[in-house]
């Protein structure tokens, strides 16, 4: 007796990132014998999309012609054969952009950073945000990103870095997101250079592990997790 | 040219509703900015009634004051921002203005404003 | 809430003088401070923004200062096209707010 199906592959295309309004793919591939193909959303009535397979009927094909709300979100995708139907896929996560304003990124002291030293880089909103994103551009994850424990909402975020490398150099943007979805994102912060001078060599950086704050007008530095409820951002490292 | 021009003012009665607009040109709403109405009685200061992001959500906030009788609402399809106003009273008597909030947290464009009268 | 104090409500000075108009958030606005120029029947006019960056067009008289909870805006030689009223606005937007805006300072001929 056979073991069970293998699970079919979720991706999509141009990527899981995806402005509001832009068109997007997600494709599932199976096996030869698929004849049908269900993708299912997270909190959504199941199926929430079914397709027949494409030839040489491996994969299918469910488009999203241009991005909204309704479409963001976490889905996994099953291929049915003579025989049943398969696993679930890896789940894709599916982010829109563009749902807030844009929130603003700064460096202090300064973006021109001595190798060795700190520099904090600041993500601000103007209006109370709960998540926090720093990414660098051509980095496979997001940097980190700092979420608001107990639905507190917070104007900023403060991303440390220490002692900063020739590695911490490069281009970063931040984006913020609201309690209604951490699948819908701000538009992106303007671009930040971070340039570095000095030789101290470290082929590793990472972003330090010290407490964050994220101060709204008040500028009451928060307390890391595990403190007071209502007391400050979470930091999820990626 | 980047302007933003309101319309719909004039006299209404106390108790009365009435929609302001405004319509922007030059620039997108649907942009990464928010859009603000403040008012202004006549011979007092600047009143900020409440902004709306121009993101897809639409997220809104309103004065304390403005919560309940006053609405923000948009058309990205129309490049316009509306103002529900209800239950009229004497004291609504402005210059209502709708300004778009820059990059720089500022308020960097204003309309003309448009003036409404409360009275019976 | 955040609740901006403006002082002096009105300011008498003549043509040449230095003239300063301060401004107080109840708590830390950082520098997301900005300050407006307003004559009679216009709209506001943007000077300054993020507490001292001057806005496009704005003479070199105007200056602003401060971060925090304290600025000021400074008129280096008040001029006879400065005779107007002025009010500082900070960039924070929340549903716990009265107002945004300052009460004004109107600075007048003395």
């Known amino acids: 007796q056979a073991g069970p199906l293998p699970k079919p592959t979720l991706w999509a295309e141009p990527g899981s990132v995806i402005s509001w309004g832009n068109s997007v793919t997600i494709w599932c591939q199976g096996t030869l014998e698929a004849r049908e193909y269900r993708l299912d959303k997270e909190e959504s009535p199941a199926p929430w999309d079914r397709q027949n397979p494409l030839e040489p009927k491996n994969k299918a094909r469910f488009s999203i012609p241009s991005m909204t709300e309704d479409y963001a979100g976490r889905y996994r995708c099953y291929y049915r054969s003579p025989v049943g139907w398969s696993q679930p896929s890896d789940p894709l996560e599916l982010v829109m952009t563009g749902a807030y304003s844009k929130p603003t990124l700064s460096a202090l002291p300064s973006p021109l950073v001595t190798s060795g030293k700190s520099v904090t880089l600041l993500c601000q909103s103007r209006s109370p945000m709960d998540t926090f994103l720093l990414i660098k551009e051509r980095a496979a994850h997001p940097l980190l990103h700092l979420r608001s424990e107990h639905g507190a909402q917070q104007h900023q975020a403060e991303f440390p870095m220490s002692p900063v490398t020739s590695v911490h150099g490069g281009t970063y943007r931040c984006f913020s997101s609201h309690g209604f979805s951490h699948y819908l994102l701000s538009h992106p912060s303007d671009p930040l250079e971070l340039i570095v001078s000095g030789s101290l060599e470290d082929p590793r950086p990472s972003p330090t592990r010290s407490v964050s704050t994220a101060a709204g007008p008040e500028d009451q530095p928060l307390m890391p997790t595990g403190s007071v409820p209502h007391s400050g951002l979470r930091r999820h490292w990626e | 040219e980047v302007q933003l021009v309101e319309s719909g003012g004039g006299l209404v009665q106390p108790g009365g509703s009435l929609r302001l607009s405004c319509a922007a040109s030059g620039f997108s709403l649907s942009s990464s900015y928010w859009i603000c109405w403040v008012r202004q009685a006549p011979g007092k200061g600047l009143e900020w009634i409440g902004s709306?992001?121009?993101?897809?959500?639409?997220?809104?906030y309103y004065a304390t004051w403005a919560k309940g009788r006053f609405t923000i609402s948009r058309d990205n399809s129309k490049n316009t921002l509306y103002l529900q106003m209800n239950s009229l009273r004497a004291e609504d008597t402005a210059v209502y203005y709708c300004v778009r909030h820059g990059d720089n947290w500022a308020l960097d464009l204003w309309g003309q404003g448009t003036l409404v009268t409360v009275s019976s | 809430d955040i609740q901006m104090t403006q002082s002096p409500s009105t300011l008498s000075a003549s043509v040449g003088d230095r003239v300063t108009i301060t401004c107080r958030a109840s708590q830390s606005i950082n520098s997301w401070l900005a300050w407006y120029q307003q004559k009679p029947g216009k709209a506001p006019k943007l000077l300054i923004y993020?507490?001292?960056t001057l806005a496009s067009g704005v003479p070199s008289r105007f200056s602003g200062s401060g971060s925090g909870t304290e600025f000021t805006l400074t008129i280096s030689s008040l001029q006879p096209d400065d005779f107007a009223t002025y009010y500082c606005q900070h960039g924070y937007i929340r549903g716990d707010l009265d107002n945004v805006f300052g009460g004004g300072t109107k600075v007048e001929i003395k």
């Open positions: 993020k507490a001292s």
């Open positions: 709306i992001d121009s993101g897809s959500v639409g997220i809104t």
